[in-house]
Interface confidence: low
């Protein structure tokens, strides 16, 4: 790299160019501006999502009423931007509307106090009350004929209800992406409700949307946690690494610009500014497609799609091929006599360039590993650039990377071997035991949910060749461990979880991996009721039955944290046999009652409970 380029980049970073594509002329009325940009249908959908993500307990009808009122008001502002209140900020307009809800105090308790505050504190207050695990009933899927009738009777209400139910359960769901899911949801019903076998057509599509939706929600939750808990710099570092892997032919200046714009989009969505977020995301997709020649050769197909599909496609696009003959990194970042000079002149630009250069050469590394390497490089320069002989001090910095790279490689190798040996269910069980012993204070439902998701890394990533395993596995684990972190933050019970979640975003996974059995844990009192099962288990789906068994396994470990793998396996095998036997019995309930007592007694004996 020519260091003339480096100096020119300093000017670039203070220029308007780096501030992205989103410098708009000031609008008299922000609400009119967004209504015109987005169109009525998207405007209404996004306001509904925003309201449902803030007031997660409000009935559907109340939200629809509020959305209609906001929409009518927006239309008056489109007609006359100088009309009364049209000059107010969106936060003010939306916050005022939310604060008209009559039952705010009864339903939300202290959240009602937010309404006594002025903007921007009021919006911050609403954001702080978003609940990652709201006390809402599980969504039960009605019969296919019932759903198709509802869809045909009132398509608009049916689709709004989908947006509402997803948004209130996932208060950080990426709003423009939820519009894309709703579009696919509508397409599934349009096609399948006319099919000969409606269920065969529809159910797999709904299952796919549900699973993809959960994954999308969790990925976005990590982005919001990154921004909110660790700041914009942490998110930008993540984005530099990921976009450099995806667009290795793009210049650093181009990547930096995309990072700036992407950061703005996600900051807005995570901050509840959903209209601005969706509008800016559309602009970013437009910019990327207009400049694809200087970004990536893989964007052509994406850029031919309609807006929602286009944005989704760009977000998921495969990595472009690496440019041939990229020079060694050592020349610019270790051997050059100007390393400390360039670092001192613009630390974040220099580190950004390091991260860009490293990431574009390593699509085989996870983003979090690349960030650990950049952090190690930064720490070394901080120390060495103050030393008597800086070059001598940092000359071996790349040697420090080796163990950092080997650790996730070894971990993935070991766990993929274990997964291949056990299969997904038993691999999940191994992780359940492992994590319950590490953090036994965490609630059983959270341990089951998180360990089941951790266990899915096997089927998701172990099938990949070596070069794709680490980015798949470790970046997925970051998403799952963030679920643990946000659930635990709501009701903190373990100092160890708090420590791993808050100390370093990129070292969360190594921190959890390093946790050993919690020797301070006082085993839970034995409660026979926890291990009492009834005939209803026989009618459950395979997945729900697994969850029941895994819940029992966690409780078992909480009672007997020092139980060996062999002991636990024996008890779980007995338990599986017991369920199978009683589900085949004529009098199932009696079988569960009598055989259950025997099983509990035998388990107590086997484990010394």
């Amino acid at each position: 790299m020519k260091w003339v380029t480096f100096i020119s980049l300093l000017f670039l970073f203070s220029s308007a160019y780096s501030r992205g594509v989103f410098r708009r002329d000031a609008h008299k009325s922000e609400v009119a501006h967004r209504f015109k940009d987005l169109g009525e249908e998207n405007f209404k959908a996004l306001v509904l999502i925003a309201f449902a993500q803030y007031l997660q307990q409000c009935p559907f009808e109340d939200h629809v009423k509020l959305v209609n009122e906001v929409t009518e008001f927006a239309k008056t502002c489109v007609a006359d931007e100088s009309a009364e209140n049209c000059d107010k900020s969106l936060h003010t307009l939306f916050g005022d509307k939310l604060c008209t809800v009559a039952t705010l105090r009864e339903t939300y308790g202290e959240m009602a106090d937010c309404c006594a505050k002025q903007e921007p504190e009021r919006n911050e207050c609403f954001l702080q009350h978003k609940d990652d695990n709201p006390n809402l009933p599980r969504l039960v899927r009605p019969e296919v004929d019932v759903m198709c009738t509802a869809f045909h009777d009132n398509e608009e209400t049916f689709l709004k209800k989908y947006l509402y139910e997803i948004a209130r359960r996932h208060p950080y769901f990426y709003a423009p992406e939820l519009l894309f899911f709703a579009k696919r949801y509508k397409a599934a019903f349009t096609e399948c409700c006319q099919a000969a076998d409606k269920a065969a057509c529809l159910l797999p599509k709904l299952d796919e949307l549900r699973d993809e939706g959960k994954a999308s929600s969790a990925k976005q939750r990590l982005k919001c946690a990154s921004l909110q808990k660790f700041g914009e710099r942490a998110f930008k570092a993540w984005a530099v690494a990921r976009l450099s892997q995806r667009f290795p032919k793009a210049e650093f200046a181009e990547v930096s610009k995309l990072v700036t714009d992407l950061t703005k989009v996600h900051t807005e969505c995570c901050h509840g500014d959903l209209l601005e977020c969706a509008d800016d995301r559309a602009d970013l997709a437009k910019y990327i497609c207009e400049n694809q020649d200087s970004i990536s050769s893989k964007l052509k197909e994406c850029c031919e799609k309609p807006l929602l599909e286009k944005s989704h496609c760009i977000a998921e696009v495969e990595n472009d091929e690496m440019p041939a003959d990229l020079p060694s990194l050592a020349a610019d970042f270790v051997e050059s006599k100007d390393v400390c000079k360039n670092y001192a002149e613009a630390k974040d630009v220099f580190l950004g360039m390091f991260l860009y250069e490293y990431a574009r050469r390593h699509p085989d590394y996870s983003v979090v590993l690349l960030l650990r390497l950049a952090k190690t490089y930064e720490t070394t320069l901080e120390k060495c650039c103050a030393a008597a002989d800086p070059h001598e001090c940092y000359a071996k910095v790349f040697d420090e990377f080796k163990p950092l790279v080997e650790e996730p490689q070894n971990l993935i190798k070991q766990n993929c071997e274990l997964f291949e040996q056990l299969g997904e269910y038993k691999f999940q069980n191994a992780l359940l035991v492992r994590y319950t012993k590490k953090v036994p204070q965490v609630s059983t439902p959270t341990l089951v949910e998180v360990s089941r998701n951790l266990g899915k890394v096997g089927s998701k990533c172990c099938k990949h060749p070596e070069a794709k395993r680490m980015p798949c596995a470790e970046d997925y684990l970051s998403v799952v461990l963030n679920q643990l972190c946000v659930l635990h933050e709501k009701t903190p019970v373990s100092d160890r979880v708090t420590k791993c979640c808050t100390e370093s975003l990129v070292n969360r996974r190594p921190c959890f991996s390093a946790l050993e059995v919690d020797e301070t844990y006082v085993p839970k009192e034995f409660n026979a009721e926890t291990f009492t099962f009834h005939a209803d288990i026989c009618t459950l789906s395979e997945k729900e039955r697994q969850i029941k068994k895994q819940t029992a396994l966690v409780e078992l470990v909480k009672h007997k944290p020092k139980a060996t793998k062999e002991q636990l396996k024996a008890v779980m095998d007995d338990f599986a046999a017991f369920v199978e036997k009683c589900c085949k019995a004529d009098d199932k309930e009696t079988c569960f009652a009598e055989e259950g007592k025997k099983l509990v007694a035998a388990s107590q004996a086997a484990l010394g409970l």
């Epitope: 650990r372 190690t376 420090e400 990377f401 080796k402 163990p403 950092l404 650790e407 070894n410 971990l411 070991q414 070292n507 190594p510 921190c511 991996s513 390093a514 050993e516």
Partner: nanobody, 123 residues
Framework: QVQLLESGGGLVQPGGSLRLSCAAS????????MGWVRQAPGKGLEWVSA????????YYADSVKGRFTISRDNSKNTLYLQMNSLRAEDTAVYYC????????????????WGQGTLVTVSS
């Protein structure tokens, strides 16, 4: 979880040498420090030596400085302790341990232990 298995202990004459090995398997943390701890008959635990990842810096108790050398082979997940000029007071069960990040303190929190290997120095 880290599993540690020591080997290489035995009976040796004063002034002799031994090389202890510790094979590590299971999940390892980035900043794990690996070390050796010993327990002489009827005595408490004594921290002997440790090596830090990722920078490879080493720590030694004053009683073994200049005589013992700690090293590790990351490709084999193995930790070593080369013990030269052995003395009678080095007789102890030697444990391999994975340590927290404050290996320099006098009583580090050993997160994971091996079963130990007995070293007897006697003529």
């Amino acid at each position: 979880q880290v599993q540690l298995l020591e080997s290489g202990g035995g009976l040796v004459q004063p002034g002799g040498s031994l090389r202890l090995s510790c094979a590590a398997s299971g999940v390892k943390a980035i900043n794990h420090t690996m070390g050796w701890v010993r327990q002489a008959p009827g005595k408490g635990l004594e921290w002997v030596s440790a090596i830090r990842t990722p920078d490879g810096s080493t720590y030694y108790a004053d009683s073994v400085k200049g005589r013992f050398t700690i090293s590790r082979d990351n490709s084999k997940n193995t930790l070593y302790l080369q013990m030269n000029s052995l003395r009678a007071e080095d007789t102890a069960v030697y444990y391999c341990a994975s340590v927290g990040d404050n290996a320099g303190s006098s009583s580090p929190p050993f997160a994971s232990w091996g079963q130990g290997t007995l070293v007897t120095v006697s003529s």
